[in-house]
C-alpha cells in the first residue's frame, strides 16, 4: 500500500467529516455572513490573520467574509487533526517520500531554506547542494547582467529566451511578469507551445548576437521543449555562419541530463540542475528560476525565496487555529465538499499579477485533480477545485456577473497591494482599484434585496433582475506591496493551501499521471501524420479528424 503516511482510506470515514455534514445541514447552508457580523462585533478581529514576512512587510488575510462561524472553524480544525495534516506536513519537511506513487520526497521547501539549516533526503543533507546551485546561479546571472558574459561577437547579452513547458515555463513567466518593476537590464521571452508560431514570433524580435537561450527540461527529452530548442539552435546557427562553437556562449541548460546537454552543444559548465524531489509545478524556486534571477537580479531572486521560506516557517510553527495556509485549505474543503462548490476564483487587483491565476491553476489542478486516495481507493467525494481568474478590474466586466448573480457558489480570493509601483495621477488609479477591491467583496457579501431595489425606483418584472442574493464568500488578501518577498510568500501560501486540501482528501498531490496518456497517444498519431495513407486505426471521430487534417494540411 502507498498509505504509509495516513491511517484512513477516505476522508468521509473521519468523525469530523460527519460532524461537518451535520453542521452544514443545521446551520452552514443557512448561515448569513451579514448576520454573523451583526452578532459578533469582533468577527473581523477574530477572522483576519496578518502574516509578517522576513523583511517586516505584512500581508493581511481576511477570512471574515466566509460562510463560517466559531463552531464551523473548530470542526474544520478537528478534521485537519483527524486527517493528520500536521503529520503529513512534518513528513514533507523531513524529506520523507510522501509522493508515494513515485516513491519520491517532496522537497521544494528545501530550495528556499536560506537559513541553510540541515534538511535531509535519504540520509543526505541537501542544504549545501541547494546553496551551491544558488551560488552558481548568482555568479552566472551577475556575469550576464553586468555584461562580463559576452556573446560570440563580443556584444553583451540583451535578451534571454527561456524554452520550456509546464512547470519549466509557467512559474518563470508569472514571476517575471509580477516582478517586472524590478527588471531593467535584460528582456526575457518565453517559448512553451509546440505551435511553431510561438518560437517563430519570438525569434523575429531577438538578435542572435545578443541572445541567451535557456533550455529548461529536466530530462532534456520533453518533446515540445527539445523541438523548440532545436529550432532555436538551427536558427542561431543559420544566422551565425553555422559554427557550433558559438553555441556555448548563447545556450545554457536547466537540466540534469548531462549526456544530452553535451550532445546538443551546450557547455556542461552552463548546466543548472535540480533533484528528483523537485516537482515541475514547484520548480520556480530551483534552477528553473534562472530566467527570473537574470531578469530581476540575484538579490531580488533570493528575497523571493526568503519570502516563501517565511511562509514555510509560519506553516510549520503556527498553531492550527492561526495557521493561515491551513485555514485557507480548510475553507476550500468546506466549500468543495459541503456546499458542492466546483470552482475557486482568484482575482488579483494588480496588473503585474495577470499570470498569477494561470500559475495557480497548474499548482492546484495538477496537484489535486485526482480521484484515487493514498489508500488506493476511489474517492466518494469531490476533490480538486476548478481554479480560474483574471486581473480585476477587467474581470468585473466579464465573469463577475456570474459570481454575483449566477446559480453557482464561487468562493473567491481577491488580492491587492496597498502600495502601487506606479502611483500615477496622484494615486488616482490606485484609489479606484482599491475601491473596487473593497466594494466587490462587500457587494458579494451584503447583496441587495428586493426592498432596496424598489427603493431605488425599480418596478414590476425588473425587480428580481436587480436583486443580489449576497452571502457569496470571499477571502481578501491585502499586501503592503508586491515585492519579491511578498510574491514568494503568496505563492508559498497557495502551495500550502493546496497541500492542506490534498492531505484532507488523502490524495497524492505530487504526481501527475493524468498527463501521460495523451502524450503516449500523440506519439502514435505523430507517426501517422508522416505518411499520406488514410487512417482507420482509431475511433471514427479521431480517424475522421486526422484524415480531414491530412487532406487540408
Amino acid at each position: 500500500s502507498n498509505n504509509s503516511f495516513t491511517n484512513f482510506k477516505l476522508a468521509t470515514e473521519l468523525p469530523a467529516w460527519s460532524k461537518l455534514q451535520k453542521i452544514y445541514e443545521s446551520q452552514g447552508k443557512t448561515l448569513s455572513v451579514k448576520q454573523e457580523f451583526q452578532k459578533d462585533a469582533k468577527r473581523f478581529e477574530k477572522l483576519n490573520k496578518t502574516f509578517t514576512n522576513y523583511d517586516g512587510s505584512k500581508i493581511l488575510f481576511d477570512y471574515s467574509k466566509n460562510l463560517v462561524n466559531d463552531e464551523i472553524i473548530a470542526a474544520l480544525i478537528e478534521l485537519a487533526k483527524e486527517a493528520n495534516v500536521t503529520g503529513l506536513r512534518d513528513a514533507m519537511f523531513k524529506g520523507e517520500h510522501i509522493n508515494s506513487t513515485e516513491d519520491r520526497a517532496v522537497y521544494h521547501v528545501a530550495l528556499r531554506n536560506r537559513a541553510n539549516k540541515p534538511m535531509y533526503v535519504d540520509g543526505v543533507n541537501v542544504a549545501p547542494e541547494v546553496d551551491s546551485v544558488l551560488k552558481h546561479m548568482k555568479e552566472f546571472s551577475e556575469q550576464v547582467r553586468s555584461g562580463e558574459w559576452k556573446g560570440y561577437t563580443g556584444k553583451k547579452i540583451t535578451d534571454v529566451v527561456n524554452i520550456g513547458i509546464g512547470g519549466s515555463d509557467l512559474g518563470p513567466v508569472m514571476v517575471t511578469e509580477a516582478l517586472k518593476h524590478y527588471a531593467g537590464v535584460l528582456d526575457v521571452h518565453f517559448v512553451s507551445n509546440i505551435d511553431g508560431t510561438h518560437i517563430a514570433e519570438t525569434l523575429k524580435v531577438v538578435d542572435p548576437e545578443t541572445t541567451l537561450f535557456l533550455i529548461a527540461s529536466k530530462t532534456f527529452t520533453t518533446a515540445e521543449t527539445i523541438t523548440n530548442a532545436n529550432t532555436a539552435k538551427n536558427w542561431f546557427l543559420s544566422k551565425t555562419g553555422n559554427d557550433p562553437s558559438h553555441i556555448a556562449k548563447h545556450f545554457a541548460a536547466l537540466s540534469t541530463n548531462e549526456t544530452e546537454v553535451a550532445k546538443f552543444g551546450i557547455d556542461t559548465k552552463n548546466m543548472f540542475g535540480f533533484e528528483s524531489w523537485v516537482g515541475g509545478r514547484y520548480s520556480v524556486w530551483s534552477a528553473i528560476g534562472l530566467s527570473v534571477a537574470l531578469y530581476i537580479g540575484y538579490d531580488n531572486f533570493e528575497a523571493f525565496l526568503k519570502g516563501a521560506e517565511a511562509v514555510d516557517n509560519h506553516f510549520t510553527q503556527t498553531p492550527l487555529e492561526d495557521n493561515i495556509p491551513l485555514l485557507g485549505g480548510l475553507l476550500s474543503v468546506w466549500y468543495n465538499n459541503f456546499f458542492g462548490a466546483q470552482t475557486h476564483l482568484v482575482a488579483p487587483f494588480d496588473q503585474y499579477l495577470h499570470r498569477f491565476p494561470a500559475y495557480l491553476q497548474q499548482l492546484s489542478m495538477e496537484s489535486n485533480g485526482k480521484s484515487v486516495t493514498r489508500g488506493n481507493v476511489f474517492t466518494d467525494y469531490s476533490t480538486g477545485s476548478i481554479l480560474f481568474g483574471e486581473p480585476a478590474t477587467n474581470a468585473q466586466h466579464s465573469f463577475f456577473q456570474l459570481v454575483h448573480q449566477g446559480t453557482k457558489l464561487i468562493p473567491s480570493d481577491f488580492i491587492l497591494a496597498a502600495q502601487s509601483h506606479n502611483p500615477i495621477e496622484n494615486k488616482l488609479h490606485q484609489k479606484m482599484l482599491a475601491s473596487n477591491f473593497f466594494a466587490q467583496a462587500e457587494a458579494l457579501m451584503v447583496g441587495k434585496d428586493e426592498e432596496q431595489v424598489k427603493a431605488e425606483g425599480a418596478t414590476g418584472g425588473l425587480v428580481p433582475h436587480k436583486v443580489f442574493s449576497g452571502n457569496r464568500p470571499t477571502t481578501s488578501i491585502l499586501a503592503q506591496k508586491i515585492t519579491p518577498a511578498t510574491l514568494g510568500a503568496l505563492i508559498a501560501y497557495y502551495e500550502h493551501v493546496t497541500f492542506t486540501e490534498g492531505a484532507i482528501w488523502n490524495i497524492n498531490s505530487f504526481d501527475q499521471w493524468g498527463v501521460e496518456l495523451g502524450k503516449v497517444l500523440a506519439k502514435v498519431i505523430g507517426k501517422e501524420l508522416d505518411n499520406s495513407s488514410t487512417i482507420s486505426t482509431h475511433d471514427a471521430s479521431t480517424n475522421g479528424l486526422i484524415n480531414q487534417f491530412k487532406e487540408w494540411m
Epitope: 533526503v121 549545501p128 551551491s132 540534469t256 553535451a262 548546466m271 533533484e275
Partner: nanobody, 117 residues
C-alpha cells in the same frame, strides 16, 4: 556528514593490477562528477581520471589505456581499475567529488598505492 572512503590500495609488483573503490555517503551521488587524483612524494597532486554524471570519462595521458574509471550510482561508489602498473604510479590516491551544478566539492582521505618489486 559527507564521507568519501577510499579502499583497495596496497603494494603491487610492476605489471600488476589494483582496483580502487571510493564509497560516498552524505551526498546526492548521482549529481556529482567523481574523480581520482594522486600525489607522489614531493610532487603536486595531479588529476588521474574523472567520470561525469552522465558517465563520460577522461584520463591523464600517462594512464590512458591502462586505467579505467567507472561508477555505480546504486552503490554510491566510484572505481578505478589500474592495470599494468609501474613505479611512476606510486602515490597516495585521492577520491574527489565535484557537484555538477555548483561550486561544491569533497575529498577523501586517500589510499596508498605502492608499485615495487
Amino acid at each position: 556528514q559527507v564521507q568519501l572512503v577510499e579502499s583497495g590500495g596496497g603494494l603491487v609488483q610492476p605489471g600488476g593490477s589494483l582496483r580502487l573503490s571510493c564509497a560516498a555517503s552524505g551526498i546526492s551521488f548521482h549529481s556529482y562528477a567523481m574523480g581520482w587524483y594522486r600525489q607522489a612524494p614531493g610532487k603536486q597532486r595531479e588529476l588521474v581520471s574523472t567520470i561525469t554524471t552522465g558517465g563520460s570519462t577522461d584520463y591523464a595521458v600517462s594512464v590512458k589505456g591502462r586505467f579505467t574509471i567507472s561508477r555505480d550510482n546504486a552503490k554510491n561508489t566510484v572505481y578505478l581499475q589500474m592495470n599494468n602498473l609501474n613505479s611512476e604510479d606510486t602515490a597516495v590516491y585521492y577520491c574527489h567529488s565535484q557537484y555538477a551544478y555548483g561550486p561544491l566539492e569533497y575529498w577523501g582521505q586517500g589510499t596508498q598505492v605502492t608499485v615495487s618489486s
